[in-house]
């Protein structure tokens, strides 16, 4: 009956962690002796390349400096104690500890056999290492110019994450990748690029990480600050305003980062009626007269800059009763 | 303590048969296989076969397989390598040895002159 | 079968030397190869297995080396103990064959 060697194709391995490489001698054969176990990596220079052996009677050794014996353990092999028994050795699962960059590669678990000679599979060891994930916004100014406005980091990944975004703004990410403090690992950033706008400012965007060191990607979600200056415009106006209303009201509304630290309110004119009184952001009417046949200008500043709005005032004589009823602000 | 203890020399004629024994104690007999391996006067090591006391199974040497016939018995813990045709080429010691690993424990050797 | 050649057939050294004997197989072994010493009149024992393991109890002035067909039996520091026949086996493949062997003389 023939034997076989039962090993996994690849496993994979926690940078730092411990791992496992499954070797197993199937099927069990009466009178089939196992002389030998050694574990091999074909790929290393010639003097590291023997990893580990394990003999009958002499139990483990472990040659090579790399990884060494402080890091190396036969799981389930056991030595024959005495010489009343034979050694365990069907199982040659081989424990890696402290897992480095230098322990990926290629292992080999051989069984020398009586009768049947020698059999051997091979087991493609990975080192993996899981990424510290952070992402956050750039306090940015308007511009016309691409600016980032939000940086996703996968710290210390091996391999490299994948960053993406998820956002339904007109944006591009630009991506630079550093060796990690960690020998082997790989730090990735991913920096979201677009015009800063008032349009983006509050807007949350979603950086996705995908590694496969984890079960699904992670999504992290990032909302944008852009400091722009006041976007204004002016509401309370409804087309009805007569000579001697008394109940209007013009708003000067407002979106702006950071918030409006002065209202001004102006008329086109240079004419400013004396019954219309400026409460910051809005400007209260006592008595509609005919000097409100004008363009009131509303102008807000922040510390970006400022903003201005516009609305003209058509003043009836009589009020228009077709219309809606008077909306006063 | 393993030990292998092996019958005393033999002188034969040619084309007469040898049969020499290998006496073994200090560990589970039938759970290791014994080998025989002989010597020829100044010459190197030569693997002839071997036998499994446990289920009786042998294997050899495709060089031997027609002369020679190893045997074990439980009951005695003893195994047995019988060469026939014998010529004076097989003059040798030949060895009974017992594989741990690699052929740790050996018989004293056993002297066997083929002479007309 | 697997053919152990072995070189040199006889070697003569002073004590403190380092020698080297070597044994080439005729198709690859991996590292399935033991060292045998044999002193006058008595069976073989084992110096190195896996072709670079040291057997326990052997001084580690004996080191093995090589993987595949060739490899190398080195004594860093001859002793006068040293004085024996030594041997290459393969147990890669069924028959086991031996190298047919070294003979070490001190001077």
């Known amino acids: 009956q023939d034997v076989r060697v039962q090993v996994l194709p690849e496993v994979r391995g926690q940078l730092g962690g411990t791992v496992e490489l499954p070797c197993h001698l199937l099927p069990p054969v009466p009178g089939l002796y196992i002389s030998l176990v050694t574990w091999q990596r074909p790929d290393a220079p010639a003097n590291h390349q023997n990893v580990a052996a394990f003999h009958p009677k002499m139990g483990p050794s472990f040659p090579s400096p790399k990884p060494g014996s402080e890091r190396l353990s036969f799981v389930s092999a056991k030595q024959s104690t005495g010489q009343d028994t034979e050694a365990e050795l069907q199982d040659a699962t081989l424990a890696l500890h402290g897992l480095t960059v230098e322990d990926e590669g290629n292992y080999t678990c051989e069984f020398a056999t009586f009768p049947k000679g020698s059999v051997r599979g091979m087991t493609w060891l990975r080192v993996i290492a899981k990424p510290k994930n952070q992402a956050e916004a750039q306090k940015v100014t308007f511009s016309q110019d691409p600016t980032t406005v939000a940086l996703c980091i996968s710290k210390e990944g091996r391999p490299p994450a994948r960053i993406s975004w998820l956002s339904s703004l007109d944006w591009e990410a630009k991506e630079t990748q550093v060796s990690g403090t960690l020998a082997g690992t790989v730090t990735v950033t991913s920096r979201f690029t677009l015009v800063p706008s008032g349009r983006a400012d509050g807007v949350t965007v979603t950086c996705k990480v995908e590694h496969e060191s984890f079960e699904e990607p992670a999504l992290i979600p990032v909302t944008l600050s852009v400091r722009y200056p006041p976007e204004v415009s002016i509401s309370g106006y409804d087309d009805n305003w007569y000579l001697g209303r008394t109940d209007a009201t013009l708003s000067c509304d407002v979106r702006s980062n950071p918030e409006p630290t002065g209202y001004d309110w102006s008329t086109t004119s240079g004419t400013f009626p004396t019954s219309a009184v400026a409460q910051g952001s809005q400007l209260v009417i006592h008595a509609v007269d005919s000097l409100f046949n004008t363009t009131f200008v509303c102008t807000v500043t922040n510390a970006v800059g400022m903003g201005r709005a516009e609305q003209v005032i058509f003043v009836r004589e009589t009020p228009n009763t077709a219309g809606a009823g008077a909306t006063g602000g | 303590e393993v030990q292998l203890v092996q019958s005393g020399a033999e002188v034969k004629k040619p084309g007469s048969s040898v049969k020499v024994s290998c006496k073994a104690s200090?560990?589970?007999?039938?759970?290791?296989?014994i080998h025989w391996v002989r010597q020829p006067p100044g010459k190197g090591l030569e693997w002839i076969g071997a036998v499994y006391p446990g289920n009786s199974d042998s294997n050899y040497n495709q060089k031997f397989k027609a002369r020679a016939t190893i045997t074990a018995v439980t009951s005695t813990s003893t195994a047995y390598m019988e060469l026939s045709s014998l010529r004076s080429e097989d003059t040798a010691v030949y060895y009974c040895t017992k594989l741990v690993g690699t052929f740790d424990y050996w018989g004293q050797g056993t002297t066997v002159t083929v002479s007309s | 079968d697997i053919v152990m050649t072995q070189s040199p057939s006889f070697l003569s050294a002073s004590v403190g030397d380092r020698v080297s004997v070597t044994c080439k197989a005729s198709?690859?072994?991996?590292?399935?190869v033991v060292w045998y010493q044999q002193r006058a009149g008595q069976p073989p024992k084992t110096l190195i297995y896996s072709a670079s393991y040291r057997y326990s109890g052997v001084p580690d002035r004996f080191t093995g080396s090589g993987s595949g067909t060739d490899f190398t039996l080195t004594i860093s520091s001859l002793q006068s103990e040293d004085l024996a026949e030594y041997f290459c086996?393969?147990?890669?493949?069924?028959?086991?064959?031996f190298g047919q062997g070294t003979k070490l003389e001190i001077k």
């Open positions: 200090g560990y589970i007999f039938t759970s290791y296989w």
């Open positions: 198709q690859n072994v991996g590292i399935n």
């Open positions: 086996q393969q147990y890669n493949t069924n028959p086991f064959t």
